[in-house]
């Protein structure tokens, strides 16, 4: 069964900068990736970026840069000039589409005990939905 993993990191040098890493584990090629964000329990969500393998990427503030890392993983840099740790209670969701097989979503948030000095590269440990 295909799976999506999500990891949210606080940047060590900038407390107001975050990076969302997402990846797709499964067969098939990716036709579209959508990254969205909102409050807990699906409240107040909106899109941050859309990445198409041929048509390019679109992003919306506070997204700073969306890019492909591999053919099946992406990263999205976020920046907020407001209070430190502005995304602490935010949920980030990544949805990968593989046409015509289907699409899969997973969501994640900044770990509560995030220490910017301990930021590590993402490892593909799936944070999975029950479905």
């Amino acid at each position: 069964t295909p799976e999506v993993w999500v990891q949210v990191q606080m940047e060590a040098t900038e407390l107001s900068s975050f990076t969302v890493h997402c990846g797709f584990l499964g067969p098939g090629s990716i036709s579209l990736v959508t990254v969205s964000w909102g409050g807990p329990d699906g409240a107040g969500g909106t899109k941050l970026a859309v990445l198409h393998p041929e048509l390019g990427t679109r992003q919306w503030a506070p997204a700073r840069q969306a890019r492909w890392e591999t053919q099946s993983s992406i990263s999205l840099a976020l920046e907020d000039s407001g209070a430190s740790s502005p995304f602490a209670n935010t949920t980030f969701c990544c949805k990968f589409a593989s046409f015509p097989e289907g699409s899969w979503e997973s969501c994640g948030s900044l770990p509560p005990s995030s220490d910017p000095g301990l930021s590590a590269p993402p490892t593909p440990v799936p944070i999975l939905r029950a479905d």
Partner: nanobody, 127 residues
Framework: EVQLVESGGGLVQPGGSLRLSCAAS????????MSWVRQAPGKGLEWVST????????SYVDSVKGRFTISRDNSKNTLYLQMNSLRAEDTAVYYC????????????????????WGQGTMVTVSS
């Protein structure tokens, strides 16, 4: 896995009304823009309408403005399309999709350019 299941299609006379529904599951529905697209027999895919994640912003293709209304109920994970004053040229398979085709200014639409898609529901307008 994401699922989008359309319902409400059928045969209706010109001037009649139908309400299409799209039940969503497997993703955080309230975070995403949703659209309706349609494919008439022998024709390409055509964008019909889009609604943003909270339902506060909608847009329509010119040919359905004033006749069709898109809406959503995030508490029920459901997208709707109310179609009034139906015409023969509205005959098509209607698909519920996640995303907004204006993101990339797509002219030749394909279901593969959306984040999720349903199996479609047929609407036939005929006397």
């Amino acid at each position: 896995e994401v699922q989008l299941v359309e319902s409400g299609g059928g045969l209706v006379q010109p001037g009649g009304s139908l309400r299409l529904s799209c039940a969503a599951s497997g993703f955080t529905f309230s975070y995403y823009d949703m659209s309706w697209v349609r494919q008439a027999p022998g024709k390409g895919l055509e964008w019909v309408s889009t609604i943003n994640s909270d339902g506060g912003r909608t847009s329509y293709v010119d040919s359905v403005k004033g006749r069709f209304t898109i809406s959503r109920d995030n508490s029920k994970n459901t997208l709707y399309l109310q179609m009034n004053s139906l015409r023969a040229e509205d005959t098509a398979v209607y698909y519920c999709v996640e995303g907004d085709p204006h993101n990339f200014g797509l002219e030749n639409l394909s279901l593969r350019d959306f984040g999720s898609w349903g199996q479609g529901t047929m609407v036939t307008v005929s006397s």
